[in-house]
């Protein structure tokens, strides 16, 4: 009988099944959904959460403007397609038949199309702007502050390697964090920009993955950081594909 | 790109035996812990027997233990299973994987795409 059988649940995901029948009676867990294997001692990835979700009941201080090539994701929640890695497959199709191409982040990036299309590759996200507006308080926070305790979140709660923590910029009351990694610069066991950017975005709508931990209690100096608006732009390595219509949309 | 490819499957008879080999290529072999893993027809992937990368420490599943043998060739970038006295309910597909484990928690990462192995008299 070991401390594993004891409290077998996954610290990280908790839209997990897990149970002691691992090497020694270890923890070995499976995603909900997919059945997938999960790794309890990191972020699991975007895919395999929303596929989880879906099958459960119900540096300068100026600001950055989003360049044209950014996506958002308006299409809300579907039931992704997975690869054995855990990451979305390239192409994603509903239930009838429409299908369409995503990005590392599972975000749309071309017009919808049919069982024809095709999606060569997956592209990867290399850039995630989150754009965050924060309740009213007494002043302005101090932006150095601010900074650090953001870096500390994710290198603390989420395992992102500090460098990949771009910048945070801060005008009252809206905050950004720049995320950027390129496929060159993710090396093996490194945290996905997206997956962090993912856990952060669920913990801010306190819907936190973490197992058994609180919601998110964000302090600068003491005082709370509450958000009450919060959006996130997606830049691909290879810029999206929509159609003019779109655009004028 | 890890890819692991099986070897060594094929029919044989209660009470025979078969060994099952592992190619592992794409990541430092003889730094990673490594699994076996079956899928009997129409059920879920069962872990079936662990060696961490040094070869010392070896773990096996109560259903196999003591007819299965799990051993590795570091210069060769081969994981091996030595199965004995196997049974009927020993059929299935074969997959190796490579693993990591915690003092609490065990996962595989990447598998091949397995090998059959069929006991029928």
């Known amino acids: 009988h070991t401390a594993a059988q004891d409290n077998c649940t996954c610290p990280t995901n908790k839209m997990t099944v897990c149970s002691p029948d691992g090497p020694g009676g270890r923890c070995q867990c499976r995603a909900l959904g997919s059945g997938m294997a999960v790794d309890c001692s990191t972020l699991t990835s975007k895919c395999l959460l929303l596929k989880a979700r879906m099958s459960a009941p119900k540096n300068a201080r100026t600001l950055v403007r989003p360049s044209e090539h950014a996506l958002v994701d308006n299409d809300g929640l579907y039931d992704p397609d997975c690869d054995p890695e855990g990451r979305f497959k390239a192409r994603q199709c509903n239930q009838t038949s429409v299908c369409w191409c995503v990005n590392s982040v599972g975000v749309r990036r071309t017009d919808k199309g049919d069982l024809s299309l095709r999606c060569d590759e997956l592209v990867r996200t290399h850039h995630i702007l989150i754009d965050l507006r924060h309740r009213p308080t007494a002043g302005a926070f101090n932006h150095s502050d601010l900074d650090a305790e953001l870096r500390r979140l994710f290198r603390e709660r989420y395992r992102l390697h500090p460098k990949f923590v771009a910048a945070v910029h801060y005008e009252q009351p809206t905050i950004q964090i720049e995320l950027r990694q390129n496929t060159s610069q993710k090396a093996a066991g490194d945290v996905d920009i997206g997956d962090a950017a993912y856990y952060f975005e669920r913990d801010i709508k306190g819907e936190s993955l973490f197992q058994g931990r609180g919601g998110l209690d964000l302090r600068v100096r003491g005082e709370p950081l509450q958000v009450e608006r919060t959006l996130i732009y997606y830049l691909d390595e290879i810029p999206p594909k929509f159609s003019m219509k779109r655009l004028t949309a | 790109q890890v890819q692991l490819q099986e070897s060594g499957g094929g029919l044989v008879q209660p009470g025979g035996s078969l060994r099952l080999s592992c190619a592992a290529s794409?990541?430092?072999?003889?730094?990673?812990?490594m699994s076996w893993v079956r899928q009997a027809p129409g059920k879920g992937l069962e872990w079936v027997s662990y060696?961490?990368?040094?070869?010392?420490?070896?773990y096996y599943a109560d259903t196999v233990k003591g007819r299965f043998t799990i051993s590795r060739d570091n210069s060769k970038n081969t994981l091996y299973l030595q199965m004995n006295n196997l049974r009927a309910e020993d059929t299935a597909v074969y997959r190796c994987?490579?693993?990591?484990?915690?003092?609490?928690?065990?996962?595989?990462?990447?598998w091949g795409q397995g090998t059959m192995v069929t006991v029928s008299s």
């Open positions: 060696i961490n990368a040094d070869g010392s420490k070896t």
């Open positions: 994987a490579r693993a990591k484990l915690t003092d609490t928690h065990y996962v595989e990462d990447y």
């Open positions: 794409g990541f430092p072999f003889s730094s990673a812990d």
